[in-house]
Interface confidence: medium
């Protein structure tokens, strides 16, 4: 039995930040789980991890240098990514593993979300006329 995951097809990060919500066909409440976000078609880069279990506080971390935070719902994890670069525009996949109670469960691969990171455009400084000459 596999958990199904729903993600938005595309998100635009205008201020180099984005909220990506992963919605699961499974209730995470009172479960030990590991929710993660992966970058690239091959999911080669693990962007962010949210780990919840009974014995310690919720852990949110990235081992790959991303600035991330996580918020939980009953059947969702929302990853908040900040300080994204234009060259990090890519497809991102949500993954979920439930370790306890048995049986171990994970998800069918989702369709992913394309995150398009828009660069910050600096507005040109207004041009003031120079001092008038007599």
């Amino acid at each position: 039995n596999k958990i199904l995951v729903k993600q938005s097809p595309m998100l635009v990060a205008y201020d180099n930040a984005v909220n990506l919500s992963c919605k699961y066909s499974y209730n995470l409440f009172s479960r030990e789980f590991r929710a993660s976000l992966h970058k690239g078609l091959d999911s080669a880069v693990e962007v962010c991890v949210v780990y919840g279990n009974y014995s310690q506080q919720l852990q949110v971390y990235s081992k790959t240098g991303f600035n991330c935070d996580g918020k939980l719902g009953n059947e969702s994890v929302t990853f908040y990514l900040q300080n994204l670069y234009v060259n990090q525009t890519d497809i991102y996949f949500c993954k979920i593993e439930v370790m306890y109670p048995p049986p171990y469960l994970d998800n069918e691969k989702s369709n992913g979300t394309i995150i398009h990171v828009k660069g910050k455009h600096l507005c040109p400084s207004p041009l003031f006329p120079g001092p008038s000459k007599p």
């Epitope: 409440f29 506080q57 919720l58 939980l72 719902g73």
Partner: nanobody
Framework: EVQLVESGGGLVQAGGSLRLSCAAS????????IGWFRQAPGKEREGVAC????????YYANSVKGRFTISSDNAKNTVYLQMNSLKPEDTAVYYC??????WGWGMLHMRHGDRGQGTQVTVSS
């Protein structure tokens, strides 16, 4: 010292209702989450519901969703669990526990003792 006192349990017929209360003291109530879990004889402990007092977020186990409602009265430092449409399988001792978030409160406070003594709920068929 963290103190949690549960009340409101009792014997009720299937289909009936009960309201459990968890009175908290010894910590800054608004900064914490309060959760309810239950333990029936010979069964694993089960997380039931949790409310985060900082933002009001609520969480429920599938087994009680739509029947149980958790709410918080920050002025009284009390959390309530309204239990409707009770079933015999809801029979258990109900405990409340406090933690800084809704994830992590279960076993952490079973071990460390930051939970109440429990209140017995018995649902007869």
């Amino acid at each position: 010292e963290v103190q949690l006192v549960e009340s409101g349990g009792g014997l009720v017929q299937a289909g009936g209702s009960l309201r459990l209360s968890c009175a908290a003291s010894g910590f800054t109530f608004d900064d914490y989450a309060i959760g309810w879990f239950r333990q029936a004889p010979g069964k694993e402990r089960e997380g039931v519901a949790c409310v985060s007092n900082s933002d009001g977020s609520t969480y429920y186990a599938n087994s009680v969703k739509g029947r149980f409602t958790i709410s918080s009265d920050n002025a009284k430092n009390t959390v309530y669990l309204q239990m409707n449409s009770l079933k015999p399988e809801d029979t258990a001792v109900y405990y409340c526990a406090a933690d800084s978030r809704c994830w992590g409160w279960g076993m952490l406070h079973m071990r460390h003792g930051d939970r109440g003594q429990g209140t017995q709920v018995t649902v007869s068929s």
